[in-house]
C-alpha cells in the first residue's frame, strides 16, 4: 500500500505518457488521477512501467471500480491484466469477443493462467453458450482448450461450433469428452458426402459407437491405424474382421505391429483365429477353431 | 550476486550500424528494467532509455530517437542497445544499467563497451 | 529537459577535510541520485533518493537537499574518496546527468 501524500508542485499528470516513468510510486499514486488513467488505459502498454509502477496503476483503478472495471477500460488493459487475480476477474462482464481476444493476446505463449481461465469462463458464462466465434477464437490461443472442459461443459457447445474444431484441438481430449463431441460433429457433418465427411469426423470418431463404426466400414474410408488406435475399445470389439479390413483398407497391414496394444489386443481376443488368419498379417490369440463363444453379457442382459 | 556482462569493443566504419549486449544474472531479469548510458571520452553521462525486458516497451530519451534501438530477450536474459548511421560523435563507452526497485537509481552497472567510429 | 549544473568542476581536498559539493537543477526535481566513478572503471550508485547510503559507501558521506538544490559532503576526506562525482535527476523524462565533479586529493 503507497502512502498518501500530496502530489508535489507541478507534478500533476495531464495526461498518461512516458514522463510517468520516473514518477515514484507515492508520486503516481498522489499525482496520477485515476479517471483520466482509466479513460487512457491503451498508453500504459507503451511505456515502460516497472511492475511495481504497474501495481499502483492497478490500486488507481481498484478505487475507482470497487465493483469491477467496465468493459472499456478491461479491452485496453494490455499488460496490466497479467496484475489481476481471479477474484478481480470475477467481478467483470466481458461481452465483446474483442475484449476477449485483446486480453488473451497479452497472454500469448504463456501457459493457460488462472486469471485467463477465469476470463474465459466468465465470458462463455456470459453468451451462455460456447459459440462458433468464441471456439474458433479460444482455440487459436490455446490449442488444447475444448480438453480443458468437463463433459458437462462441453454439452453446452452448440454442433454449429464444431466447424471451428481442428484436428489438433482435440489432441487431449479423453473419451468422455469425445463421447459429448461426436454426437454433435456427426450432427454438423452429416450433410457432407461420404469422403468429406470423413475427413472431417475423424478427429471425432474416439467419441463413436459400434454401429457407426460398422456404417463407415461400408464406405471405403481407409482410416489410418493412429484414429483406430483411438477408438472406444467397447466400440471395436463386437466388429467383424472383415468390417475392420475394410474399415482400414491398406491400413489394414499396421494392425500386426499393435496387436499387443488396445483396442487392438482385446479385438484380437473376441475373433476366431480362422478369420484372422484371412488377413494374412500372422496376428495371433484368437478364438481356436471349434470353440463357442458365449457373449455372457448379452446374456445377462436378457435375464 | 547480480552481474551485467557486456560485449567486447568495436570498431566500426561510419555509416554502419552495431549493436553491443549486456547479459544479466544473478536476479530475475523481467522484474527490474534496463537502461543504457553513454559516456564519451571521461566527459559526462548521458541517459539512452530504458527498456522493460518482461513487455519489450521502451522509452528513450529524445536525442537518440532514431539513433538507438533496445531491445530485450527475455530467454537468454540479455538486453541489447543497436546504434545505426554511425558518425565520429557516437564514439563512446555506452553501460547498460539496472534500474532499481521504486526508482533508487542505477544500482548496477555492465563494464561498459566501448564503441570507436572511425574510416 | 531538465539541466543540472554541478560545482566546481574540480576541487582538491585534505586527507581529513569536510568537503562538499552541490547540484542545481533548472527546474524543480523530486529526487537526486550520486553516482562515484573512478578512472577506467564504470559508475558506482553512492547516494540514491537523495540522502541514502548505497551498500558499502562509508557513513561519512552524505546527500540533502530539495526543489533545484542538493548537495553530497564528506565529513572528512580520505584518499579513497578521490573521483568523479556525478548527479543524476530522478523526475522529469529523460533521466539526466551533472558534468561531474572531480574530487582530488591534495
Known amino acids: 500500500e503507497v502512502e498518501k501524500t500530496a502530489c508535489p508542485s507541478g507534478k500533476k499528470a495531464p495526461e498518461i505518457d512516458e514522463s510517468l516513468i520516473f514518477y515514484k510510486k507515492w508520486e503516481l499514486e498522489a499525482c496520477v488521477d485515476a479517471a483520466l488513467l482509466a479513460t487512457q488505459m491503451d498508453r500504459v502498454n507503451a511505456i515502460p512501467f516497472t511492475y511495481e509502477q504497474l501495481d499502483v496503476l492497478k490500486h488507481k483503478l481498484d478505487e475507482l471500480y470497487p465493483q469491477g472495471y467496465p468493459e472499456s477500460v478491461i479491452q485496453h488493459l494490455g499488460y496490466l491484466f497479467l496484475k489481476m487475480s481471479p477474484e478481480d476477474i470475477r467481478k467483470w462482464n466481458v461481452t465483446s469477443l474483442e475484449t476477449l481476444k485483446a486480453l488473451l493476446e497479452v497472454n500469448k505463449g504463456h501457459e493457460m493462467s488462472p486469471q485467463v481461465a477465469t476470463l474465459i469462463d466468465r465470458f462463455v458464462k456470459g453468451r451462455g453458450q460456447l459459440d462458433k466465434d468464441t471456439l474458433d477464437t479460444l482455440t487459436a490461443f490455446y490449442p488444447g482448450y475444448l480438453c480443458s472442459l468437463s463433459p458437462e461443459e462441453l454439452s453446452s457447445v452448440p454442433p454449429s461450433s464444431i466447424w471451428a474444431v481442428r484436428p489438433q484441438d482435440l489432441d487431449t481430449c479423453d473419451p468422455r469428452q469425445l463421447d459429448v463431441l461426436y454426437p454433435k460433429a456427426r450432427l454438423a457433418f452429416q450433410n457432407m458426402n461420404g469422403s468429406e465427411y470423413f475427413v472431417k469426423i475423424q478427429s471425432f470418431l474416439g467419441g463413436a459407437p459400434t454401429e457407426d463404426l460398422k456404417a463407415l466400414s461400408q464406405q471405403n474410408v481407409s482410416m489410418d491405424l493412429a484414429t483406430f488406435m483411438k477408438l472406444r475399445t467397447d466400440a471395436v470389439l463386437p466388429l467383424t474382421v472383415a468390417e475392420v479390413q475394410k474399415l482400414l483398407g491398406p491400413h489394414v497391414e499396421g494392425l500386426k505391429a499393435e496387436e499387443r496394444h488396445r483396442p487392438v489386443r482385446d479385438w484380437i481376443l473376441r475373433q476366431r483365429q480362422d478369420d484372422l488368419d484371412t488377413l494374412g498379417l500372422g496376428l495371433q490369440g484368437g478364438i481356436p477353431n471349434g470353440y463357442l463363444v458365449l457373449d455372457l453379457s448379452m446374456q445377462e442382459a436378457l435375464s | 550476486q547480480v552481474q551485467l556482462q557486456q560485449s567486447g569493443p568495436e570498431l566500426v566504419k561510419p555509416g554502419a550500424s552495431v549493436k553491443i549486449s549486456c547479459k544479466a544474472s544473478?536476479?530475475?531479469?523481467?522484474?527490474?528494467?534496463m537502461n543504457w548510458v553513454k559516456q564519451s571520452n571521461g566527459k559526462s553521462l548521458e541517459w539512452i532509455g530504458v527498456?522493460?525486458?518482461?513487455?519489450?516497451?521502451?522509452s528513450y530519451n529524445q536525442k537518440f530517437k532514431g539513433k538507438a534501438t533496445i531491445t530485450a530477450d527475455t530467454s537468454s536474459n540479455t538486453a541489447y542497445l543497436q546504434l545505426s548511421s554511425l558518425t565520429s560523435e557516437d564514439s563512446a563507452v555506452y553501460y547498460c544499467?539496472?534500474?532499481?526497485?521504486?526508482?533508487?537509481?542505477?544500482?548496477?552497472w555492465g563494464q561498459g563497451t566501448l564503441v570507436t567510429v572511425s574510416a | 529537459d531538465i539541466v543540472i549544473t554541478q560545482s566546481p568542476a574540480i576541487m582538491s581536498a585534505s586527507p581529513g577535510e569536510k568537503v562538499t559539493m552541490t547540484c542545481s537543477a533548472s527546474?524543480?526535481?523530486?529526487?537526486m541520485h550520486w553516482y562515484q566513478q573512478k578512472s577506467g572503471t564504470s559508475p558506482k550508485r553512492w547516494i540514491y533518493?537523495?540522502?541514502k547510503l548505497a551498500s558499502g559507501v562509508p557513513a561519512r558521506f552524505s546527500g540533502s537537499g530539495s526543489g533545484t538544490s542538493y548537495s553530497l559532503t564528506i565529513s572528512s576526506m580520505e584518499a579513497e574518496d578521490a573521483a568523479t562525482y556525478y548527479c543524476?535527476?530522478?523526475?522529469?523524462?529523460?533521466?539526466?546527468f551533472g558534468a561531474g565533479t572531480k574530487l582530488e586529493i591534495k
Open positions: 533518493d537523495t540522502s
Open positions: 543524476q535527476q530522478w523526475s522529469s523524462n529523460p533521466l539526466t
Open positions: 527498456i522493460n525486458p518482461n513487455y519489450g516497451t521502451t
Open positions: 544499467a539496472k534500474g532499481d526497485y521504486d526508482g533508487a537509481g542505477f544500482a548496477y
Open positions: 544473478g536476479y530475475s531479469f523481467t522484474d527490474y528494467n
Open positions: 527546474s524543480s526535481v523530486s529526487y
